[in-house]
């Protein structure tokens, strides 16, 4: 007979049970796979020299045997010879020292019996009372079972633990949790009430936290102020330093860490809600406000330590978006309306002195006027932006004030207070002779070129005494020099400079006369 | 002549049904263990089913559990193969096959007879 087949002869041995105490017993056997079958047993006694039969008899009465030599456990086909569709009746026989004992004979449908399953599926994992909980769908048909568990941690090997008898369509098991390192568990199941019986293969890992989670290790990246006055926050996570065990590596669930973003919008501190708290997958939308981010993390047990950083305002400025008319009876500052219905935060301080509060006012819903403008007035009285200096102004518009990640930025500018006229007038204006015909023109720069985007040129103003003929020449805002060609000599000049605004224009300086000398030739 | 011939195949969607008859002639078959098996392309033949003598005891492949169904009619000299729930991966050419000796193996080759086969095409 080969030995991958059920032989259909007498056994080599003299088939009488010696009835002793020891022998073969929980003979169990199962289908493994769709053609595959195992059957495996105990031995009591001493193993040496001890051969032995896996018995098995057929519906028809015909009888057969494996021989396994020293081993107690077996496999074999469904190509072996023996009836896997109809019931058989199997034993085992087994032979030292002159001497047969036979185990109880367990009589079954082989292709009906299938081996106990691990926990399948999901295995659900919760807290309690410092200890680990978890709980699973019984297989089916498979109601009643011993369970066992293993876990190891990224430095140790598999420990083993005992979850009980388990007696209900699911099961569940108390396992120890560690504080501070991620565990991998595996859990195996055996039918209840047949010690003999095999074990289930291992589930797949279950991979657990610490108790604690980790402090999350993010960067972050802020995109460009897009057109709607928006730039996306985009958080590059990092891989947690969290070291894992060898069957927890890759992308296993369970382990993971959670993140969710608490946005806090510093800029502009009279609207209704600053705060806001989001989920990390869920990338917001900034204004180009200033912000706090704190990325707190959390696992499946619970919320961890926090990360907080700062995200500067953007400091892009729309130079010409903002108008503003300075009146007698106040200031009205105009800009590009929005949508119906949305509320505006105007938000002013003066530069150099970003580290103080900025002052904040925030409009009523408005619509737009006919002109498809926004407005916002303030009297002379109230002070605001009175002062002859420097101030930025941030505009900030939502049509759900409440929310916190739809505010965008309408604008941002610059605005020299006070008498802007008056206050930038250029001084220290000098001439010098250049050539022939020509003269240099140079002055001390304006007091609105401190803020950025406000003036908008220098006019250089030369009237010829003579003739009272007036030439006017802009000068880019950023020189404080020009020159003035085709002169005549002997014609007394007087020239001015002013410094103009997109919506102002300037004081003239004080006149500076000024003649070229008449060459005499030899 | 002893004869197996399946019917009853076809294009089928994915969840329909479709039903397979064996019809056995040339000598009585109500005696054998019956059974269905199925072959894809460039796969062995697979177990799909089996049902013996007196319909006492079924056996399914764990891949048509609860969506199959193995039945007899001696009196007509017929098996049938319920299928329910189809899908894709189901579609193959289904075979009939006997085992006159009891043999009660899910190997096709302790079969003795066998029919033609019947294509069945599962759509998505």
């Known amino acids: 007979c080969r030995t991958s087949e059920c032989c259909f002869q007498d056994p080599p041995y003299s088939d009488a049970d010696s009835g002793s105490a020891s022998g073969p017993r929980d003979l169990s056997c199962y289908r493994i796979s769709s053609a595959g079958y195992e059957c495996s047993w105990q031995y009591e006694g001493p193993t040496a020299g001890v051969s032995h039969f896996l018995r098995c008899c057929l519906s028809s009465g015909r009888c057969c045997y494996f021989a396994t030599g020293s081993a107690t456990r077996l496999q074999f086909s469904d190509q072996a010879g023996v009836s896997v569709l109809h019931t058989v009746t199997l034993w085992v026989e087994s032979w030292a020292r002159n001497r047969t004992e036979k185990s109880p004979e367990v009589t079954l449908q082989l292709y009906k019996s299938v081996k106990y399953k691990p926990p399948l599926g999901d295995i659900k994992v919760s807290k309690l009372a410092g200890q680990l909980r978890m709980e699973w769908e019984t297989p089916d048909n498979q109601v009643g079972a011993e369970v066992q568990f293993r876990h190891r941690t990224p430095s140790s090997s598999w420990k083993l633990g005992d979850c009980g008898p388990q007696d209900d369509d699911t099961e569940s098991c108390l396992c120890p949790l560690e504080m501070n390192v991620a565990q991998e568990f595996q859990l195996r199941r055996r039918r209840l009430g047949s010690q003999g019986s095999s074990w289930s293969k291992w589930s797949s890992p279950v991979c657990v936290p610490p108790e604690n989670p980790p402090q999350p290790q993010v960067r972050f990246s802020v995109e460009q102020l897009g057109r709607d006055g928006r730039r996306r926050l985009t958080l590059k996570e990092q891989p947690t330093q969290l070291e894992l065990p060898e069957g927890c590596q890759g992308p296993a669930p369970g382990v993971e860490v959670t993140y969710q973003l608490q946005l806090h919008m510093l800029s502009c501190p009279c609207k209704a809600k600053a705060t806001r708290t989001l989920p990390l997958e869920k990338m917001p939308y900034l204004s180009g406000a200033a912000y706090n981010v704190a990325v707190i993390s959390s696992n499946r047990f619970g919320p961890g330590p926090n990360q907080t950083w700062h995200i500067p305002a953007d400091t892009h400025t729309e130079p010409v978006a903002l108008n503003i008319s300075v009146g007698t009876n106040g200031t009205t500052m105009y800009w590009p309306a929005r949508a119906q219905s949305t509320t505006y935060c105007i938000e002013w301080q003066p530069v150099g002195q970003e580290g103080s509060l900025a002052t904040c006012n925030l409009t009523a819903p408005q619509d737009p006027d006919p002109a498809g403008m926004a407005t916002y007035s303030w009297s002379r009285e109230s002070g605001a932006m009175g002062q002859e200096k420097c101030y930025h102004i941030t505009i900030f518009a939502s049509a759900h004030p409440k929310k916190l990640t739809l505010w965008s930025t309408v604008l941002s500018t610059y605005h020299f207070g006070g008498n802007a006229s008056a206050a930038g007038t250029p001084h220290h204006v000098s001439v010098k002779n250049h050539s022939l015909d020509s003269v240099s023109v140079d002055w001390a720069p304006s007091l609105l070129s401190t803020c950025p985007g406000v003036l908008k040129e220098y006019v250089v103003r030369c009237r010829d005494e003579d003739s009272n003929q007036v030439s006017e020449h802009p000068v880019q805002p950023t020189e404080t020099q020009v020159t003035l060609s085709d002169l005549r000599a002997g014609v007394a000049y007087t020239v001015q400079v002013r410094a103009d605004t997109a919506w102002l224009r300037g004081a003239w300086s004080q006149p500076q006369r000024f003649s070229i000398k008449v060459q005499v030739s030899d | 002549q002893v004869q197996l011939v399946e019917s009853g195949g076809g294009l089928a969607q994915a969840g329909g049904s479709l039903r397979l008859s064996c019809a056995a002639s040339?000598?009585?078959?109500?005696?054998?263990?019956m059974a269905w098996f199925r072959q894809a392309p460039g796969k062995e033949r697979e177990f799909v089913a089996h049902i013996d003598r007196n319909a006492a005891s079924t056996n399914y492949a764990d891949s048509v559990k609860g969506r199959f169904t193995i039945s007899r009619d001696n009196a007509k000299n017929t098996v049938y193969l319920q299928m329910t729930r189809l899908k894709p991966e189901d579609t193959a050419v289904y075979y009939c096959a006997a085992d006159p000796d009891h043999f009660g193996t899910t190997w096709y080759q302790q079969y003795t007879y066998w029919g033609p086969g019947t294509q069945v095409t599962v759509s998505s």
């Open positions: 040339g000598r009585t078959f109500s005696n054998d263990d």
